[in-house]
Amino acid sequence: GSERTCCPVNWVEHERSCYWFSRSGKAWADADNYCRLEDAHLVVVTSWEEQKFVQHHIGPVNTWMGLHDQNGPWKWVDGTDYETGFKNWRPEQPDDWYGHGLGGGEDCAHFTDDGRWNDDVCQRPYRWVCETELDKASQEPPLL
């Protein structure tokens, strides 16, 4: 595949990455799958600067990111290390709250109305953000 040099139509370029902001809601797993089908992944926030960029574009709306602990430890979908990486949880979060009564706790992370993060039930239909790196080889064959 060829190296992607510019962002697809309707995607926003920022710091050598491309971002796509949904305007509808999906469960976390469906959002994750949507991004994968676009040869991308749910957004992985690695810096305060990236946090502010995403926050500016999503506004005060609950929005899924690529962070979850469905397998036990907190993990970013692209393999970025959670332990040493950037974190922006709301105070008291994550709390794996069981009081929602939907069964189980809370295993998926989202941006809240003030941009800080919360863990929530993965089935909730929130908006989402896809991200792909410009330097990543695309799956499309090169134009001859």
Epitope: D69, G72, P73, E83, D95, Y98, G99, G104
Partner: antibody
Framework: EVQLVESGGGLVKPGGSLRLSCAAS????????MNWVRQAPGKGLEWVSS????????YYADSVKGRFTISRDNAKNSLYLQMNSLRAEDTAVYYC????????WGQGTLVTVSS | DIQMTQSPSSLSASVGDRVTITCRAS??????LVWFQQKPGKAPKSLIY???SLQSGVPSKFSGSGSGTDFTLTISNLQPEDFATYYC?????????FGPGTKVDIK
């Protein structure tokens, strides 16, 4: 590497108190719910108590409610279980474990309640 | 509280066998079930979580299935290191509850 190490077990008389500790390392402790699970000699596993990452939510088994207190110190990466009014039936190996489905366990510490 | 039952309480099997252990919840717990293996004098070890997801580092000879109230753990090609006690636990709601265990020993 994720590690959980319990300490503080020992022999105590009925009605006595004991404080168990669990030292955690290898992960961002404050991001995880932690649990105490016990196992009486020759018996099965029994969930005892859970505490959310920032201590906002705390849960106890009916068998220990009012006698045991779970707490944590995220600055010290430590989980605690204060056990008061101990009974013979509290004799068990006490394990600390991470997350609601206990993906990681400590080696356990033995608590013996006997006169 | 949700009660968990397991069957059988014990079973004898031979090396190479395929064994199945059943766990039943007194009310629906969706997929919120974990299976543990415990050997004498050791801490339990999680094998399967979310009813059917294999824990990292656990061999694929272990598999889980089920949802709602009925769940199974299957161990294929039983080996000497698999002889142990197996527990299920629900984490759908507090208080968390364990099954009484199934001891798998050598025939």
């Amino acid at each position: 590497e994720v590690q959980l190490v319990e300490s503080g077990g020992g022999l105590v008389k009925p009605g006595g108190s004991l404080r168990l500790s669990c030292a955690a390392s290898g992960f961002t402790f404050s991001s995880y719910t932690m649990n105490w699970v016990r196992q009486a000699p020759g018996k099965g596993l029994e969930w005892v108590s859970s505490i959310s990452g920032s201590s906002s939510y705390i849960y106890y088994a009916d068998s220990v409610k009012g006698r045991f207190t779970i707490s944590r110190d995220n600055a010290k990466n430590s989980l605690y279980l204060q056990m008061n009014s101990l009974r013979a039936e509290d004799t068990a190996v006490y394990y600390c474990a991470r997350v609601s489905w206990a993906d990681c366990w400590g080696q356990g510490t033995l608590v013996t309640v006997s006169s | 509280d949700i009660q968990m039952t397991q069957s059988p309480s014990s079973l004898s099997a031979s090396v190479g066998d395929r064994v199945t252990i059943t766990c039943r919840a007194s009310q629906g717990i969706s997929k919120y079930l974990v299976w543990f293996q415990q050997k004498p004098g050791k801490a339990p070890k999680s094998l399967i979580y979310a009813a059917s997801s294999l824990q990292s580092g656990v061999p694929s000879k272990f598999s889980g299935s089920g949802s709602g109230t009925d769940f199974t753990l299957t161990i294929s090609n039983l080996q000497p290191e698999d002889f142990a006690t197996y527990y299920c636990q629900q984490y759908n709601s507090y208080p968390f509850t364990f099954g009484p265990g199934t001891k798998v020993d050598i025939k």
